[in-house]
C-alpha cells in the first residue's frame, strides 16, 4: 500500500475520533450511500512503520458505526493509517481511508456528572473511570460552568493526580430559592472547540430566613 496515494480515499465517509469516558472511540457516518452496509470492518497500520493493514478484532464484521480503539491506539504521537470497509452480505460496497493523529485530531466528550442542590451550595459529582491510561490524559482540565439568571461562572477545579475515580466539587456561596444550571466539559490546553454537557438544573431550597418569613405571614 502506498500511504501517499489517494487510492483508498473516499469522501463518502466522515470520521470522528473522540475521547469518551477516557476511551478512544472512532465513529463514522456515511454520505450518499444508496445501499446501507450490513456490517463494517476496520483495519489500520502505523505510518512510521508501515506494515500490512491489521484488522481491529472487536471491529471486524461489526454492525455498529463506531469502534473502541483504546487498546489498539496507544500513542498520541503516531499517525494511524485507517481503512473502513463496508459490506452488504459478502459484497464489498466501499472502503474509505483516513489518517488519525490523536494529539491533534481527538475531540473530548464531557464526563458524566450528577448534581445535588442544597440551600446555598451545589455538589457536583463528576464520574471518571477508575483507571485511565497515562497516554489518554491529554493535558486536559475539567471545567464546571454554573449558570443563573443569565450569568455564567467558570470553575476550574484542581484535580490532584490524574482524572480517575469519582470527583466531587462544591459550588458554594449560592442564593437560596434560586434556579441554577450546571454544565461540565473537558478543556484541552489549546483552543480546540469544547463539547459541553447538556445543562442539569436545580432549584435550591429556600433558606431559613425566607422560611421564617413565610411562616410569619
Amino acid at each position: 500500500i502506498s500511504y501517499d496515494s489517494p487510492d483508498y480515499t473516499d469522501e463518502s465517509c466522515t470520521f470522528k475520533i473522540s475521547l469518551r469516558n477516557f476511551r478512544s472511540i472512532l465513529s463514522w457516518e456515511l454520505k450518499n450511500h444508496s445501499i446501507v452496509p450490513t456490517h463494517y470492518t476496520l483495519l489500520y497500520t502505523i505510518m512510521s512503520k508501515p506494515e500490512d493493514l491489521k484488522v481491529v478484532k472487536n471491529c471486524a464484521n461489526t454492525t455498529r458505526s463506531f469502534c473502541d480503539l483504546t487498546d489498539e491506539w496507544r500513542s498520541t504521537h503516531e499517525a494511524y493509517v485507517t481503512v473502513l470497509e463496508g459490506f452488504s452480505g459478502n459484497t464489498t460496497l466501499f472502503s474509505c481511508s483516513h489518517n488519525f493523529w490523536l494529539a491533534i485530531d481527538m475531540s473530548f466528550e464531557p464526563p458524566e456528572f450528577e448534581i445535588v442542590g442544597f440551600t446555598n451550595h451545589i455538589n457536583v459529582m463528576v464520574k471518571f473511570p477508575s483507571i485511565v491510561e497515562e497516554e489518554l490524559q491529554f493535558d486536559l482540565s475539567l471545567v464546571i460552568e454554573e449558570q443563573s439568571e443569565g450569568i455564567v461562572k467558570k470553575h476550574k477545579p484542581e484535580i490532584k493526580g490524574n482524572m480517575s475515580g469519582n470527583f466531587t466539587y462544591i459550588i458554594d456561596k449560592l442564593i437560596p430559592n434560586t434556579n441554577y444550571c450546571v454544565s461540565v466539559y473537558l478543556e484541552h490546553s489549546d483552543e480546540q472547540a469544547v463539547i459541553k454537557s447538556p445543562l442539569k438544573c436545580t432549584l435550591l431550597p429556600p433558606g431559613q430566613e425566607s422560611e421564617s418569613a413565610e411562616s410569619a405571614k
Epitope: 505510518m47 503516531e78 499517525a79 481511508s97 483516513h98 489518517n99 493523529w101 491533534i104 485530531d105 489549546d190
Partner: antibody, heavy 117, light 112 residues
Framework: QVQLQQSGPELVRPGVSVKISCKGS????????MHWVKQSHAKSLEWIGV????????RYNQKFKGKATMTVDKSSSTAYMELARLTSEDSAIYYC??????????WGQGTSVTVSS | DIQMTQTPLTLSVTIGQPASISCKSS???????????LNWLLQRPGQSPKRLIY???KLDSGVPDRFTGSGSGTDFTLKISRVEAEDLGVYYC?????????FGGGTKLEIK
C-alpha cells in the same frame, strides 16, 4: 510527488496583518496535519503551531498565541497562517510543513515576510 | 519548553573524513509509548530544510547510509562516515515528544 507550494514574499508595514498560504498536492491533503515554522537569523527555527487539516483543531506554541492564526480550506487543499500586528521581530521566513503524527516530513519552499516602514 | 543544544556551532571537515554533531535536550525525549521523537534536518544553502532522520535513527528515503543517528534520553548524535560535497549546509535536531516542539540552534557543516 508531495509538494507544498507557498505564497510569494511579502513586504509590509508595521502594525498591519499578513496572510500566507500553503497549497498541498500529490497526497491526500486531509490525511496530514500542517505545521508552521518560523526561521529568523536571531532565533534559528521556531515551531509556531499545527492545524488538523481534517477537523481544523489547532495547537499553538504559547509564544505565538495572539500573533499567529492558522486556518485551513479543505476544498482547495490549502492551509493559511495570518500574522497580526506585525513588527520588525516578525521579519523572517515562514515554512509550512506536513506531518503524519510527530514526524514533520515535507517542507514548503518558505515565504519571506519583511516588516519595514 | 524543552531546550535543544547543538554542538559544535560550526564544523569544518575535509571531504572523505567523518563528522559528528551532538544534540542534547533539557529533558528526556523518551515518550510513554516507548519511542523517542528526536529528528534531524539538513538545510542546504538557499533551500528549505529537508528531513534526514526521524525517531533517532530511521533514515528518510533517499538519505545515503553514510548518515547514522544514535542516542537516547537526552543525548543524541548525528554521524557522517565520509563527508561529501553535497552534505554541506546547516544541520538541525528537533524534538516532537513534548509540545511545543523545539529545535536546536543548528550546526553549520563547511568543507575545508
Amino acid at each position: 510527488q508531495v509538494q507544498l507550494q507557498q505564497s510569494g514574499p511579502e513586504l509590509v508595514r508595521p502594525g498591519v496583518s499578513v496572510k500566507i498560504s500553503c497549497k498541498g498536492s500529490g497526497y491526500t491533503f486531509t490525511d496530514y496535519a500542517m505545521h508552521w515554522v518560523k526561521q529568523s537569523h536571531a532565533k534559528s527555527l521556531e515551531w509556531i503551531g499545527v492545524i488538523s487539516t481534517y477537523y481544523s483543531n489547532t495547537r499553538y506554541n504559547q509564544k505565538f498565541k495572539g500573533k499567529a492564526t492558522m486556518t485551513v480550506d479543505k476544498s482547495s487543499s490549502t492551509a493559511y497562517m495570518e500574522l497580526a500586528r506585525l513588527t520588525s521581530e516578525d521579519s523572517a521566513i515562514y515554512y509550512c510543513v506536513r506531518s503524519g503524527g510527530s514526524n514533520m516530513d515535507y517542507w514548503g519552499q518558505g515565504t519571506s515576510v519583511t516588516v519595514s516602514s | 519548553d524543552i531546550q535543544m543544544t547543538q554542538t559544535p556551532l560550526t564544523l569544518s571537515v575535509t571531504i572523505g573524513q567523518p563528522a559528528s554533531i551532538s544534540c542534547k535536550s533539557s529533558q528526556s525525549l523518551l515518550d510513554s509509548d516507548g519511542k523517542t521523537y528526536l529528528n534531524w534536518l539538513l538545510q542546504r544553502p538557499g533551500q528549505s530544510p529537508k528531513r534526514l532522520i526521524y525517531l533517532v535513527s530511521k533514515l528518510d528515503s533517499g538519505v545515503p547510509d553514510r548518515f547514522t543517528g544514535s542516542g537516547s534520553g537526552t543525548d543524541f548524535t548525528l554521524k557522517i562516515s565520509r563527508v561529501e560535497a553535497e552534505d554541506l549546509g546547516v544541520y538541525y535536531c528537533w524534538q516532537g515528544t513534548h509540545f511545543p516542539w523545539t529545535f536546536g540552534g543548528g550546526t553549520k557543516l563547511e568543507i575545508k
